[in-house]
């Protein structure tokens, strides 16, 4: 089942898939003057059995020279988007990932693909945290959170990871911080981009992978 | 929470045109096809076309090419469709539905009477 | 235009009950297939995504298969509450269409 909404946001914090269950989807979308394809898939889905998944369908896209726009639309400039993206690259693939049963690689980018790639998790998906650069994690517990299924209704597991400042001064132990959830988010908001960088797959962030910068929009 | 909330119930003239709001929130407007479908009994479900706010992009069936006209307005998150020439065979239901995950908005019933 | 037939329009079913609504595509459309559950006077509630996936919070009595042109949407232990017009859809090309919908009744 999809999850209904996106996994929870820590202040300073990113989080990234390792590996994506069967069902996930990820939707076509195009760079800026490109479009995705009439006849196109409109998602890739990771698919298969428990030996052996892949994405299914492939994302297209084609120039929008001919674009059909109206007064009314009004194409966000960079500077105006919410959020900001950096240029996608290949990610690196963890090297014990293939190994997990019923869950698809990174999908390979395609051809003017765009800079923000959308997920729609399932439930049982894990996404793992890291705090971004210029901060330090002081953990209580695991820096991952989970898509769960409870009576009926699907919720993301809170990660219990606190991203401090570098300056500053560290927390007593026991010292409670409130845990802050994200403000000004308009309209209930579930949109999340993220952009990995050096992304631990253990809880403890012992174990790194190689550099890899890209951006992902969740819902 | 995704939703689409869309205008109310029109009683419109034939020969007019009438424009249909659909607003949308929870998620980001912009980085998903809106489509747009009418339902007439008896007839069943019919796809019209769809937009893609981000870039003004717009998909059209071939059967609604003339009649419909689909736009958005992405500074407050809400996409429209104007039908014209309105005859009686355009008395329907209009429901405006994100395209994929499809989430769908109440619908809006156009009546076209004189 | 890809032609979706529910050659079925009524189908009467029992509480409890295990019913399959069919949905045959005209030609191959793969696995980009969705169905729909519109309760009288709502608007149609996707339940199945890529022929067999369910969206979050469908009950999983509803399950969905098939690919290619044959598709199944099959509710196990039928609730009343699953009195419903059931849609299947393709969007593996455009335009995107619907089956003619098939309406189930709880004896």
């Known amino acids: 089942e999809l999850c209904d909404d996106d996994p929870p946001e820590i202040p300073h914090a990113t989080f990234k898939a390792m590996a994506y269950k069967e069902g996930t989807m990820l939707n076509c979308e195009c760079k800026r003057g490109f479009r995705r394809i009439k006849s196109g898939s409109l998602y890739m889905l990771c698919t298969g059995n428990s030996s052996h998944s892949s994405w299914d369908n492939q994302c297209q896209c084609t120039s929008s020279a001919t674009r059909n726009t109206t007064k009314q639309v009004t194409p966000q400039p960079e500077e105006q988007k919410e959020r900001k993206t950096t240029e996608m690259q290949s990610p690196m693939q963890p090297v014990d990932q293939a190994s997990l049963p019923g869950h698809c690689r990174e999908p390979p980018p395609w051809e003017n693909e765009a800079t923000e790639r959308i997920y729609h998790f399932v439930v049982g998906q894990m996404v793992y945290y890291q705090c971004v650069q210029g901060y330090r994690a002081l953990h209580r517990g695991p820096a991952e959170s989970v898509c769960k299924m409870t009576h009926g209704k699907t919720r993301w597991t809170q990660p219990q990871l606190i991203c401090t400042g570098e300056m500053e001064t560290s927390q007593f132990p026991g010292e409670e911080k409130p845990q802050a959830s994200p403000e000004g988010r308009p309209e209930s908001e579930t949109s999340c981009l993220v952009t990995t960088t050096d992304f631990q797959i253990q809880t403890e962030m012992a174990a790194t992978m190689e550099t890899s910068i890209f951006t992902t929009e969740y819902q | 929470q995704v939703q689409l909330q869309q205008s109310g119930a029109e009683l419109v003239r034939p020969g007019t045109s009438v424009k249909i709001s659909c607003k949308a929130s929870?998620?980001?407007?912009?980085?998903?096809?809106l489509g747009w479908i009418k339902q007439r009994p008896g007839h069943g479900l019919e796809w019209i076309g769809d937009?893609?706010?981000?870039?003004?992009?717009?998909n059209y069936n071939e059967k609604f090419k003339g009649k419909a006209t689909l736009t958005a307005d992405t500074s407050s998150s809400t996409a429209y469709m104007q039908l014209s020439s309105l005859t009686s065979e355009d008395s329907a239901v209009y429901f405006c539905?994100?395209?994929?995950?499809?989430?769908w908005g109440q619908g809006t019933s156009l009546t076209v009477s004189s | 235009d890809i032609q979706m037939t529910q050659s079925q329009k009524f189908m009467s079913t029992s509480v409890g009950d295990r019913v399959s609504v069919t949905c045959k595509a005209s030609?191959?459309?793969?696995?980009?297939v969705a169905w729909y559950q519109q309760k009288p006077g709502q608007s149609p509630k996707a339940l199945i995504y890529?022929?067999?996936y369910r969206y979050s919070g469908v009950p999983d009595r509803f399950t969905g298969s098939g690919s290619g042109t044959d598709f199944t949407l099959t509710i196990s232990n039928v609730q009343s509450e699953d009195l419903a017009e059931y849609f299947c859809?393709?969007?593996?090309?455009?335009?995107?269409?619907f089956g003619g919908g098939t309406k189930l009744e709880i004896k």
């Open positions: 539905a994100r395209v994929t995950p499809a989430s």
């Open positions: 929870g998620y980001t407007f912009t980085n998903y096809w």
């Open positions: 937009i893609y706010p981000g870039g003004g992009y717009t």
């Open positions: 030609q191959n459309v793969g696995t980009n």
């Open positions: 890529s022929a067999s």
């Open positions: 859809q393709q969007y593996n090309s455009y335009p995107y269409t």
